[in-house]
Amino acid sequence: SQVSQNCHNGSYEISVLMMGNSAFAEPLKNLEDAVNEGLEIVRGRLQNAGLNVTVNATFMYSDGLIHNSGDCRSSTCEGLDLLRKISNAQRMGCVLIGPSCTYSTFQMYLDTELSYPMISAGSFGLSCDYKETLTRLMSPARKLMYFLVNFWKTNDLPFKTYSWSTSYVYKNGTETEDCFWYLNALEASVSYFSHELGFKVVLRQDKEFQDILMDHNRKSNVIIMCGGPEFLYKLKGDRAVAEDIVIILVDLFNDQYFEDNVTAPDYMKNVLVLTLSPGNSLLNSSFSRNLSPTKRDFALAYLNGILLFGHMLKIFLENGENITTPKFAHAFRNLTFEGYDGPVTLDDWGDVDSTMVLLYTSVDTKKYKVLLTYDTHVNKTYPVDMSPTFTWKNSKLPNDITGRGPQ
C-alpha cells in the first residue's frame, strides 16, 4: 500500500529500523545514541546554512518475541515485518536507515516499491550490489574482492615480484556476518575473484586447514581467512607452518592493530592482516565510549547515515527541490560528504569507499607494520614499507605455487 512520507513542510523524519537480527551484536541503545548524535550535527549544519527546518528520527523496533535470534541468517522476514508495521502506521520518513543483514536488505529491496532511499550499515553480500536506492556505509564484499584480485596480480613491487593466481579460502560457517559474506563472495563460482584465479579451494574443516600448513603437495601457498588473531590462534595454535605459506587475515573492522602497546603474537608472523585505515576522532565521542573497537565502525555507519541524509537534504532544500521524489531516492551515490570522522566517499552504486591497509608482523619489533594501502575508489595499491622485515625468505612474499621461492 502507498505509505505517505513524513517529509515536507519543513519537517523531515528519518525512519530507523532497530532490528533484533543485526550484522553486529550491538545494543540498540548504542545505535540510538549514534543516531541522536548525528541528528544534533545535522541540525547544526542545516541551521548554519540558514535552513530553518526540523529533522527527527523515529525508531522502529521489531517484535522481539518473533525475531529474537540476533543472527542475520534468520533475518529475512524481520525487515518485511518492520515495513508492514510502518505501512500499518502510515508513517514513513524521508529515508530508511536500517537493515544491516544481507538477507533482510535483499528481501526488503525485492519486495517493496522503493521510492525512498535506504541506507545500510552492513548488507555486505554480493546480492546487495548495484541496487539503485541502496547506500552501504560499511565496505561490501565487492570492494574486498577487488583488492584481493589487485593484490594477487601485483608483481612489480620490490617485496612482491610474483603474480599470484591461486588460493585456499578457509570458511567453516561460524563466521560473523561481515566475514560470512566476504568469504561467500570469494567462494562464489561466478564472482570476479573466482573468475580471475586459476585455482581456488574452500577449506571447511579445521583439520583441512591445519593439514595444508605443512602439506608438501598443497596447490597454493596462500590461505585467505576472516576474523581476528584469536580466531586464527584457535585454529592454528602453535603448529609449524611451511616457510612459504602466506595467510591473509581479513579483519576490516578492527583497529586494535594500530594501538601503541599492541605486540603481535608469534603465530602472526606468517600472516598479512587486511584491515581498514583507522579513524581518529571516535575515541572520545560520547556514543562510542561504551563500544569495543570492532563495534565502532557499525555505530559510526549509523551516525554517518544520518549525516549523509543531512547532506542530501541540505542540497535539495538549497536547490528548492522536492524530497519525496525518485530523484532524491537515487541521489545517494557518486558523492563525498562530511562524515563524523572526515570525508566519506560513495561510489557510483552508493557503496562506501575506503582505504584498506595490509599489515605484516615485523620480525624485528614484533609490531604490526603497514606494508601497503589500497584505495577502493581508484582500485590502486600504494606501497608504504619498502623495506619490510618479513619472516619470508629474502624479505619478499613467496610465490603462490609451492616449490618456487622468491626470485
Epitope: 612489480d156 613491487l157 619498502m386 623495506s387 629474502n394
Partner: antibody, heavy 119, light 107 residues
Framework: QVQLVESGGGVVQPGRSLRLSCAAS????????VHWVRQAPGKGLEWVAV???????DYNAAFISRFTISRDNSKNTLYLQMNSLRAEDTAVYYC?????????????WGQGTLVTVSS | DIQMTQSPSSLSASVGDRVTITCRAS??????LNWYQQKPGKAPKLLIY???RLQSGVPSRFSGSGSGTDFTFTISSLQPEDIATYYC?????????FGQGTKVEIK
Amino acid sequence: QVQLVESGGGVVQPGRSLRLSCAASGFTFSNYGVHWVRQAPGKGLEWVAVIWSGGRKDYNAAFISRFTISRDNSKNTLYLQMNSLRAEDTAVYYCARHGTYPYWYFALWGQGTLVTVSS
Amino acid sequence: DIQMTQSPSSLSASVGDRVTITCRASQDISNYLNWYQQKPGKAPKLLIYYTSRLQSGVPSRFSGSGSGTDFTFTISSLQPEDIATYYCQQGKTLPFSFGQGTKVEIK
C-alpha cells in the same frame, strides 16, 4: 664505466612542459629501479619519483598530477615528463639508481640538469 | 609521510675535530637511514647506508649509528676535503625523504 647522464634542462615559461632524459651506461639498466631527485637553488634534496624494475611508478604526492616518470629499457634511458611548470619547479634535477633490495639508498647519481622556470 | 629533521643546520669546526650531526625521523624507520655528502655544484655522494655501513671507497673516519628514530653521523677527524653539506635520507617508506642538510665549514 657505470654512469648516469641527464639532459633536457633549460629555461621554460610557466605553464609549459619539458621532458628530461637520463641515459644509463655500464650496468644492466632494466634490473634497477631509477629515481628522479631535485634540488632547488640553495635548498635541500627532494625525492620526486621512482620507476621500479618491474615498471611500477611511484610519486611524491606533490608531483603526481603534473610529472610522469617513464623508461625505455631498450634505450637504457629514464624520462621525466613535466607539465604545467611553475616557478617553484626551478631546480637541478638528478636521476639516481638505488641500491639492492631492501636498502633504498642512492648509490649512483647523474651530474644533474638545471631547469629554470621563468617568464 | 616521514619527516627527517637534521641538526645543526650548519657548524664550523677545526681540522682534526670530531664532528657530529644528528638526524631524527618522525616515525620508526628501523635502520634504513643513509648519509650523503654534497659539495657545491656537484651531485650528492653516498657515504653510509643502513645506518652504519660504509659505502665502498669512503674513508673510515666517517661513521654512523642509531636505530628507530634517532641517528648520528660522525666525522672522527675533520679534513679540509670534508667541507660540504651532509644529508640524511630515510629508505623505509615512500615517499623517500631527506633531512634539510647540515653545512660543515672549517674554522
